[in-house]
Amino acid sequence: ASVATELRCQCLQTLQGIHPKNIQSVNVKSPGPHCAQTEVIATLKNGRKACLNPASPIVKKIIEKMLNSDKSN
């Protein structure tokens, strides 16, 4: 079993290379008893879900942009 399924993580893998224009929203789940890792779960414009690598510079930019747009709404 992977580390993810050993706990109750939702991200079993992370998707590499996703264009920000395909992302509708992003949810960042902090570590907790259910999962030891930070998880970044994107809802795509086609309704599907994808896990993103929280350490990736582009993902950090996407999160920052999404959070800023939430604040301005």
Epitope: A1, A4, T5, E6, L7, R8, C9, Q10, C11, L12, Q13, T14, L15, N27, K29, G32, P33, H34, I41, T43, R48, K49, A50, C51
Partner: antibody, heavy 125, light 107 residues
Framework: EVQLLESGGGLVQPGGSLRLSCAAS????????MSWVRQAPGKGLEWVSA????????YYADAVKGRFTISRDNSKNTLYLQMNSLRAEDTAVYYC??????????????????WGQGTPVTVSS | DIQMTQSPSSLSASVGDRVTITCRAS??????LHWYQQKPGKAPKLLIY???NLESGVPSRFSGSGSGTDFTLTISSLQPEDFATYYC?????????FGQGTKLEIK
């Protein structure tokens, strides 16, 4: 056919012990988390405990922590709930449930998509 | 712990009615919410997963929506077999928690 079958329920005195079993068939048991959920007479659903696919991680509701132990034997496709120091408030129907399902290669959700028929536990003197 | 509050706790409706049940979480849970149906003496049955996805084999008259803290289960046109108790459940974090249930009765 995917199936879960609980057994081991019954009448027990306060302070007593009971071990519930849940026999699984029709799916790769070791790949999925499993949960126990209970329902007291005339009440709603209450989550009791969960266990990861390998059995390496376990989770408990505060009400049963330190008294109940969840475990699994993947070679026998069986889930267990060892219940010690039983109290009147533990009286309920106990269900085991499978936690499915993979949506995408990159994302997993935990929904109780298959349930057993339930086994009644009565704690009374 | 995350508390889940359903409303109403009971509801009387007629065949053909449109019915909405709401579920509120005590903190944001994204869309980590499921809906179950339970009939007397039977095990619960998964209806909707991740707030809005219809479980395989569930009639399309059932739908779910919401994100964050507020969620709804809608039955577009009640059928006789839909009279049951409905529960929401969060899996955002442990301990997993259910709403107290909404009993749907025939008017």
């Amino acid at each position: 056919e995917v199936q879960l079958l609980e057994s081991g329920g019954g009448l027990v005195q306060p302070g007593g012990s009971l071990r519930l079993s849940c026999a699984a068939s029709g799916f790769t048991f070791s790949e999925l988390s499993m949960s126990w959920v209970r329902q007291a007479p005339g009440k709603g659903l209450e989550w009791v405990s969960a266990i990861s696919g390998s059995g390496g991680s376990t989770y408990y509701a505060d009400a049963v922590k330190g008294r109940f132990t969840i475990s699994r034997d993947n070679s026998k496709n069986t889930l267990y709930l060892q219940m010690n120091s039983l109290r009147a408030e533990d009286t309920a129907v106990y269900y085991c449930a499978r936690e499915g399902g993979r949506l995408e290669p990159y994302y997993y959700y935990y929904a109780m998509d298959v349930w057993g028929q339930g086994t009644p536990v009565t704690v009374s003197s | 712990d995350i508390q889940m509050t359903q409303s109403p706790s009971s509801l009387s409706a007629s065949v053909g009615d449109r019915v909405t049940i709401t579920c509120r979480a005590s903190q944001s849970i994204s869309d980590n919410l499921h809906w179950y149906q339970q009939k007397p003496g039977k095990a619960p049955k998964l209806l909707i997963y991740d707030a809005s996805n219809l479980e395989s084999g569930v009639p399309s008259r059932f739908s779910g929506s919401g994100s964050g803290t507020d969620f709804t289960l809608t039955i577009s046109s009640l059928q006789p077999e839909d009279f049951a108790t409905y529960y929401c459940q969060q899996y955002y974090s442990t301990p997993l928690t259910f709403g107290q249930g909404t009993k749907l009765e025939i008017k």
